[in-house]
């Protein structure tokens, strides 16, 4: 297969970093990280016609170049620039769904509503979803033992910088009405420190984006509160309004029914509020 050819061609031995080396507070690189990234790239480019011309070997070269031989607390957005370029993807800019602290439901939604896209529905997001990776300074080794934790070690680590970079670009590409799914079960429904709150909100382009529409997802079945009145949602509205983007908010009281109605909009029970 194409994947075997790639590994045959490069014959890279991915050694674990010896245990006596720097110990970080976070989990180490996901096992079989290079193979996983390449396999995901091949799969994605086979399924998505607009990305079929992308060379997965070059994508992997760009990915590893971003963090191999570099100190895992000193990664910059510039390190990821080649990967970002190769992963440039034209998604319908008016069909973007952002999310914060509610990834699974957002992904379930775009699996049904196929014309909408989360970041993880793009090549770069798909490659890295749920993976961890880091290297170490001046060696070509991948560290499978431990990687820096954002809070306990450093924020400029390979994983955090990657998601900050792709999230910024994803938000910059959005236009018209942008949707965001927020978790109404959390104490901070909108969290300024989340990727959405710290990166995406500030990189929506007012000249292209007309409205940000928040969908607040309720957790409890009997929860009939209007969570759009939550102070953190009001804070989000204020930030967005100051950026000359309109804001709207909807409560999704029954996420299970919401998904069902996306699948079957003709269902008679789908006319009532969900």
């Amino acid at each position: 297969s194409g994947l075997n050819d790639i590994f045959e061609a490069q014959k890279i031995e991915w050694h674990e970093v010896p245990r006596w080396r720097q110990q970080w507070s976070g989990p180490g690189t996901t096992k079989r990280f290079p193979e996983t990234v390449l396999a995901r790239c091949v799969k994605y480019t086979e399924i998505h016609p607009e990305m079929r011309h992308v060379d997965c070997q070059s994508v992997w070269d760009a990915f590893k170049g971003a963090f191999i031989s570099k100190h895992p607390c000193n990664i910059t957005e510039e390190d990821y620039q080649p990967l970002m370029k190769l992963g440039t993807q034209t998604v319908p800019c008016n069909k973007i769904l952002l999310w914060s602290r509610i990834k699974d439901l957002a992904h379930q939604f775009t699996q049904v509503q196929r014309d909408m896209f989360t970041l993880e529905d793009t090549l770069l997001g798909y490659l890295a979803d749920d993976l961890t990776w880091c290297g170490e300074f001046n060696t070509s080794k991948i560290n499978y033992q431990s990687c820096p934790d954002w809070r306990k070690d450093c924020s400029n680590n390979p994983v955090s910088v990657f998601w900050k970079t792709v999230s910024r670009r994803f938000a910059e590409a959005a236009c018209d009405v942008v949707h965001v799914m927020l978790n109404g079960s959390r104490s901070k429904i909108f969290d300024k420190n989340s990727t959405f709150g710290s990166v995406e909100v500030h990189n929506l382009q007012p000249e292209k984006v007309q409205t940000l529409e928040a969908w607040v997802i309720h957790g409890g079945r009997e929860d009939s509160r209007d969570l759009c009145q939550d102070p953190t949602i009001k804070e989000l509205e204020s930030i967005i309004s100051k950026r000359n983007i309109q804001f709207s908010c909807k409560n999704i009281y029954r996420p299970d029914k919401f998904l069902q109605c996306v699948k079957n909009p003709e269902d008679s029970s789908c006319t009532s509020e969900i």
Epitope: E50, M51, H53, V54, S58, D61, A62, G65, I68, S69, E77, D79, Q81, P82, M84, K85, L86, G87, T88, Q89, T90, P92, C93, R168, R169, E172, A173, C175, K208
Partner: antibody
Framework: EVQLLESGGGLVQPGGSLRLSCAAS????????IIWIRQAPGKGLEWVAA?????????YYADWAKGRFTVSKDNSKNTVYLQMNSLRAEDTAVYYC???????????????WGQGTLVTV | DIQLTQSPSTLSASVGDRVTITCRSS????????LAWYQQKPGKAPKLLMY???NLASGVPSRFSGSGSGTEFTLTISSVQPDDFATYYC??????????FGGGTKVEIK
């Protein structure tokens, strides 16, 4: 001052090979994408290949150029190369190298160009 | 394959005229606005005029302006000057970092 200077063009028989060079000066070579673009006589522009070398070489090609054309870079000489094999009459063109604007808001655009080198097949 | 179609292919104008060139892409450009315009004079390399559809490149006179998004874009010269008679190319940026150029519009003296 940013300068790009192409060389290596000339007359070649169909099926032959040629290596073009693009010598760069006046900027930090490793921090920019260098793109090869060609223009057939009296025709429009067409991109060929791109290369970036922050640590290792990262390169990619227009679909039509894959297999026949290879881009490479010698950082010590501040030079990018375009190796062209199995040349055909339709490859006759002026070949330019260009530097892409840097920064993610500007990628995808070419701010500095060489004067071009003519390849005749 | 991505196609960028420019119209008209040739345009005759007098000094002071307002000129508009259209560029249509067969696919939406990256970010809805990742399109550039270049000016090329005979025997010379192209020169960047506009980027991101409507941003003027450094040193380009303000009589040049750009607009459009998605698949349809225009370059306007509000009042053509003698130095503006040249060929103009649009260029889009697409998935996977691919580039495509339009076929060109030659602006000649009437």
């Amino acid at each position: 001052e940013v300068q790009l200077l192409e060389s290596g063009g000339g007359l070649v028989q169909p099926g032959g090979s040629l290596r073009l060079s693009c010598a760069a000066s006046g900027f930090s070579f490793n921090n920019y994408w260098i793109i090869w673009i060609r223009q057939a006589p009296g025709k429009g522009l067409e991109w060929v290949a791109a290369i970036y070398s922050p640590s290792g070489d990262i390169k990619y090609y227009a679909d039509w150029a894959k297999g026949r054309f290879t881009v490479s870079k010698d950082n010590s000489k501040n030079t990018v190369y375009l190796q062209m094999n199995s040349l055909r009459a339709e490859d006759t063109a002026v070949y330019y190298c260009a530097r892409e604007l840097s920064g993610s808001s500007y990628e995808g655009y070419f701010e500095s160009w060489g004067q071009g080198t003519l390849v005749t097949v | 394959d991505i196609q960028l179609t420019q119209s008209p292919s040739t345009l005759s104008a007098s000094v002071g005229d307002r000129v508009t060139i259209t560029c249509r892409s067969s696919q939406s450009v990256y970010g809805h606005n990742w399109l550039a315009w270049y000016q090329q004079k005979p025997g010379k390399a192209p020169k960047l005029l506009m980027y991101r559809a409507s941003n003027l490149a450094s040193g380009v006179p303000s009589r040049f302006s750009g607009s459009g998004s998605g698949t349809e874009f225009t370059l306007t010269i509000s009042s053509v000057q003698p130095d503006d008679f040249a060929t103009y190319y649009c260029q889009g940026y697409y998935s996977g970092g691919a580039y495509a150029f339009g076929g060109g519009t030659k602006v000649e003296i009437k």
